[in-house]
């Protein structure tokens, strides 16, 4: 399957949240590359 | 909620000038390539340009290469098309859209916005 | 260029009919995306990448296809599927529409 830039993000937020209540740790973001736009893409999610 | 505005339509003679704006809020827009589509006053839908999230990637059909320039402001939120050479057949409403793909899928422009209307008439 | 043809310009249905909507490439596309518009309106994405719904698409719609030919599916026609529907190649550039095809309810 592929993945969709959603649920990264919303996943990311989780353990970014996990991160600061269980270990301390304070992560302030992700560097997204930027991509060309994907022409081999296949069908299907 | 997602929103995109267009702005900068306006009536102008061939071989004129216009610069469209595209506001957008709602979600964090250096992560989205974004694209124009205009609709032709038959209704016909037609791809104008595409520029990825960080704005490396710049894409054109045949049609308007060379005369359109899609550019992007992302401490701004604002997308923007730079026309010039305009010709009759230019005339539409130019919709901006947000374009949700990545390095190896395509889920399509899944925003909208309201559109601007752009008539080339002398 | 890569043509994309909607043979069936307006098409009308009946409510609780199965409706299917056609959409045909020039040459081989990996996937298809369809657009909703409904007049006065901007399209809305409506079923991206050949057969996935996008959000608040009502589940009697469905999509499929592969190569040269696609098509959306609803199930039981309502009064509010009637709207242009309009098929979008991204397999290759430039990108390109199909001119529509206008559903009315009967």
């Known amino acids: 399957g592929t993945i969709n830039v959603h649920d990264v993000e919303t996943q990311f937020n989780q353990y970014k949240t996990e991160a600061a209540s269980r270990y301390n740790l304070t992560i302030s973001d992700v560097s997204v590359s930027d991509v060309p736009f994907p022409f081999s893409a296949q069908s299907g999610a | 909620e997602v929103k995109l505005e267009e702005s900068g339509g306006d009536l102008v003679k061939p071989g004129g000038s216009l610069k469209l704006s595209c506001v957008v809020s709602?979600?964090?827009?250096?992560?989205?390539?974004m694209s124009w589509v205009r609709q032709t006053p038959g209704k016909r839908l037609e791809w104008v340009a595409t520029i990825s999230g960080g704005g490396t990637y710049i894409y054109y059909p045949d049609s308007v290469k060379g005369r359109f320039t899609i550019s992007r402001d992302n401490a701004k939120n604002t997308l923007y098309l730079q026309m010039s050479s305009l010709k009759s057949e230019d005339t539409a409403m130019y919709h901006c859209?947000?374009?949700?793909?990545?390095?190896?899928?395509?889920?399509?422009?899944?925003?909208w916005g309201q559109g601007t209307s752009v008539t080339v008439s002398s | 260029d890569i043509v994309i043809t909607q043979t069936t310009a307006i098409m009308s249905a009946s409510p609780g009919e199965e409706v299917t909507l056609t959409c045909s490439a020039t040459s081989s596309v990996s996937y298809i995306h369809w657009f909703q518009q409904r007049p006065g309106t901007s399209p809305k994405l409506w079923i991206y990448?050949?057969?996935n719904l996008a959000s608040g698409v009502p589940v009697r719609f469905s999509g499929s296809g592969y190569g040269t030919s696609y098509s959306l599916t609803i199930s039981r026609m309502e009064a509010e599927d009637a709207a242009t529907y309009y098929c979008q190649q991204r397999s290759s550039s430039p990108f390109t529409f199909g001119s529509g095809t206008k559903l009315e309810i009967k």
């Open positions: 859209t947000r374009d949700n793909y990545g390095r190896n899928y395509d889920y399509g422009m899944d925003y």
């Open positions: 990448s050949t057969s």
């Open positions: 709602g979600f964090t827009f250096s992560r989205y390539g």
